[in-house]
């Protein structure tokens, strides 16, 4: 069956939280993407912003994670409403803020 | 006051097992990532292994000289944690520290602060 | 295993600077801190993520890294600041920590 959202919520944050524990050096080479809105719908977001970097091993899980956590099919290129298509910010801040906000979510019970 | 008491540490046989525990006060122990390291007799200092938050998972990691005897764990309900130790050898001894473990520093709610208990002596001896 | 090198020693007399070097192969990717441990005492984290000087840790004390080394440097080095410094750092996973073996600094006064 479907994994429950607050599983997949953990599942998230704890990839995040490997990809950059005590990580100086940039993440996929310092590459840049669409800073986004954390707010309804981000996980979309996140995935149409990371889903533009390419040949990044380090996030491949997290892609995959929040391909299961997007309702709607996602494909590079692609952009919503959602995104702040005026910033960009590199991959390892991107996941830094990402990650803060999830674990705010998690403690407030927001699984969706 | 920010602080770490251990205790638990103490003589025992090859072989034996020993669990020890520290408590945590003075800041938020479910955010931080905690860590024991050990000091043999004369010797430098040795990461023993740690535990995450469980918001970031919880998972536990060790040193390959205790992988597979040491077990960390921690009760957040308590502000304690604790490396159970079996299957104990005389190179285990050493005095035993907890502290909050930096790299997860920045996931938690004490970027900068360093917190260690005053370590608890453990003997390993026939 | 991953493993972090110091020089077993280093000596300066007073007010002189004093450098301790740390290298490892996952150093480039990888922050480094440093702990100062003084007789019977427990350790005292003096450098975080490679530079960053915790609260209520003098000045004199800074920290640096370049590629595969990191340095803690202690500029115009006193009589109290003779102890054990260790640097610490994770393998390049980032789950297993790591301890170099220790630098004693001795401060001839």
């Known amino acids: 069956g479907p994994v429950p959202p607050s599983t997949a919520l953990r599942e998230l944050i704890e990839e995040l939280v490997n990809i950059t524990q005590n990580q100086k050096a940039p993440l996929c080479n310092g590459s840049m993407v669409w800073s986004i809105n954390l707010t309804a719908g981000m996980y979309c977001a996140a995935l149409e912003s990371l889903i533009n970097v390419s040949g990044c091993s380090a996030i491949y899980r997290t892609q995959r994670i929040l391909h299961g956590l997007c309702p709607h099919k996602v494909s590079a290129g692609q952009f919503s409403s959602l995104h702040v298509r005026d910033t960009k910010i590199e991959v390892a801040q991107f996941v830094k803020d990402l990650l803060l906000h999830l674990k705010k979510l998690f403690r407030e019970g927001q699984f969706n | 006051e920010v602080q770490l008491v251990e205790s638990g540490g103490g003589l025992v046989k090859p072989g034996g097992s020993l669990r020890l525990s520290c408590a945590a006060s003075?800041?938020?122990?479910?955010?931080?990532?905690m860590s024991w390291v050990r000091q043999a007799p004369g010797k430098g200092l040795e990461w023993v292994g740690r535990?995450?938050?469980?918001?970031?998972?919880?998972?536990?990691n060790y040193a390959a000289p205790v992988k597979g005897r040491f077990t960390i764990s921690r009760d957040d309900s308590k502000n304690t944690l604790y490396l159970q130790m079996n299957s104990l050898k005389t190179e285990d001894t050493a005095v035993y520290y907890c502290?909050?473990?930096?790299?997860?520093?920045?996931?938690?709610?004490?970027?900068?602060?360093?917190?260690w208990g005053q370590g608890t002596t453990v003997t390993v001896s026939s | 295993s991953y493993e972090l090198t110091q020089p077993p020693s280093v000596s300066v007399s007073p007010g002189q600077t004093a450098r301790i070097t740390c290298s490892g192969d996952?150093?480039?990717?990888?922050?480094a801190y440093w702990y100062q441990q003084k007789s019977g005492q427990a350790p005292v984290l003096v450098i975080y993520e490679d530079s960053k000087r915790p609260s209520g840790i003098p000045e004199r004390f800074s920290g640096s890294s370049s590629g595969t080394m990191a340095t803690l440097t202690i500029s115009g080095a006193q009589v109290e600041d003779e102890a054990d410094y260790y640097c610490?750092?994770?393998?390049?996973?980032?789950?297993?920590?790591?301890f170099g073996g220790g630098t004693k600094l001795t401060v001839l006064g």
């Open positions: 502290a909050t473990d930096q790299v997860g520093a920045y996931y938690g709610d004490y970027y900068g602060m360093d917190v």
């Open positions: 003075g800041f938020t122990f479910s955010n931080a990532w």
């Open positions: 996952a150093l480039p990717e990888k922050y």
């Open positions: 610490h750092s994770t393998d390049s996973s980032g789950n297993h920590g790591v």
């Open positions: 535990i995450r938050s469980e918001i970031d998972g919880g998972t536990t």
